[in-house]
């Protein structure tokens, strides 16, 4: 089953996908599409790359903000709406017989959560949890965990009814390794 990523309406969603070019710099075509990966290509393509660069994008909201030339083809969807919810396919079209890497990831877009305390704290939180909120400017690899954060009691409405999170610092650290398992 797909790994779920959750973003708030109006924020940016980050859907991870990567490969290791072999040899380095030897890029392969990648497509991102809405809908599970079919037997070839992607359905409802939103972005496509070739051996050199992004060469097809259906909207200016879709970006590859990672190091594309090192194989980071994670998709950023800017300013998400509820209509962006659904399964997305990242297909890496690797040379060879039946070698394509296919990754299905599920984006769930929710209405803005009621968060206490400051929004900046919520922003770090949402960047760090794969089955929680994944909005923000940067992907999980770039998320910085502050050296010390107070324990907080955070309530997020519209998300599993109510989610109580304590000892935020440890939670963030623990989740950092798992978010990339798309």
């Amino acid at each position: 089953s797909e790994v779920e990523y959750i973003a708030e309406v109006g924020q940016n969603a980050y859907l991870p996908c990567s490969y290791t070019p072999a040899p380095p710099g030897n890029l392969v075509p990648v497509c991102w599409g809405k809908g599970a990966c079919p037997v070839f290509d992607c359905s409802n393509v939103v972005l496509r790359t070739d051996n050199r660069d992004v060469n097809d994008r259906t909207s200016g909201r879709y970006w590859l903000k990672g190091d594309f030339h090192k194989g980071d083809v994670s998709l950023t969807i800017e300013n998400v709406t509820l209509a962006d919810s659904g399964v997305y396919c990242c297909r890496i079209q690797i040379p060879g017989i039946m070698n394509d890497e296919k990754h299905n990831v599920k984006l769930v877009v929710i209405k803005p959560a009621k968060v206490t305390p400051a929004p900046t704290l919520q922003r770090d939180l949402t960047s760090a949890f794969p089955r929680m909120l994944t909005t923000g400017e940067h992907g999980p690899a770039e998320t910085q965990t502050p050296g010390s954060l107070p324990d907080v009691n955070l309530t997020v409405s519209n998300f599993f009814c109510e989610l109580q999170i304590f000892t935020l610092t440890n939670e963030l650290r623990d989740s950092g390794a798992t978010i990339r398992t798309a």
Partner: antibody, heavy 120, light 107 residues
């Protein structure tokens, strides 16, 4: 507009290798957005997808034929190829090369097909 | 592999009539179903892809619907050139498979 033309022997002996060439004109085989495919149709029957090759070198074969089939490409000649080894009478069919265009609105281009008969 | 079953095997209609062709998959193919038209001595031609999208250059009288396991191709008003064999094809799971075809013939 992309045009495709199959060529190759119309008669192959059992146990030999069937070899077909598809020549592409009106488009580059090395450009993205096209899946270069082989499909066959047994006489009076339905269609069977043999496999495809993408410009990246990504290749997919029908598992029922995988051990016997090879699809390759020569970008300098703008051609792609089908080889099917150890043929039997069951491989007698019309063989089509086709290109499925997937950028924008999907479309397709087909050769006219070539009948290959396997017989001694 | 996924088996596609088309019905009816033959459909006898007159020009101007509405044709409704059915395709049922042995397991869900989501919306990854295409329809092809084939005339005698010719290669197939893609009509509909992803269940309901018309391919390049296909007239509006052809429409597709359905998802999961049950799909329909509708030709709203048959033209003389529409009498042919129609195949459904799935691209949800490898290998892509075709139905056995429905022949639309002149009544």
């Amino acid at each position: 507009q992309v045009q495709l033309q199959e060529s190759g022997p119309g008669l192959v002996k059992p146990s030999q290798t069937l070899s077909l060439t598809c020549t592409v004109s009106g488009g580059s085989i090395s450009s993205g957005g096209y899946y270069w495919s082989w499909i066959r149709q047994h006489p009076g029957k339905g269609l069977e997808w043999i496999g495809y090759i993408y410009y990246s070198g990504s290749i997919y074969y029908n598992p029922s034929l995988k051990s016997r089939v090879t699809i390759s490409v020569d970008t300098s000649k703008n051609q792609f190829y089908l080889k099917l080894s150890s043929v039997t009478a069951a491989d007698t069919a019309v063989y089509y090369c086709a290109s499925l265009m997937v950028w924008g609105v999907m479309g397709d281009y087909w050769g006219q097909g070539t009948l290959v008969t396997v017989s001694s | 592999e996924i088996v596609l079953t088309q019905s009816p095997a033959t459909l006898s209609l007159s020009p101007g009539e509405r044709a409704t062709l059915s395709c049922r998959a042995s397991q869900s193919v989501s919306s990854y179903l295409a329809w092809y038209q084939q005339k005698p001595g010719q290669a197939p031609r893609l009509l509909i892809y992803d269940a309901s999208n018309r391919a390049t250059g296909i007239p509006a009288r052809f429409s597709g619907s359905g998802s999961g396991t049950d799909f329909t191709l509708t030709i709203s008003s048959l033209e003389p050139e529409d009498f042919a064999v129609y195949y459904c094809q799935q691209r949800s799971d490898w290998p892509p498979t075709f139905g056995q075809g429905t022949k639309v013939e002149i009544k």
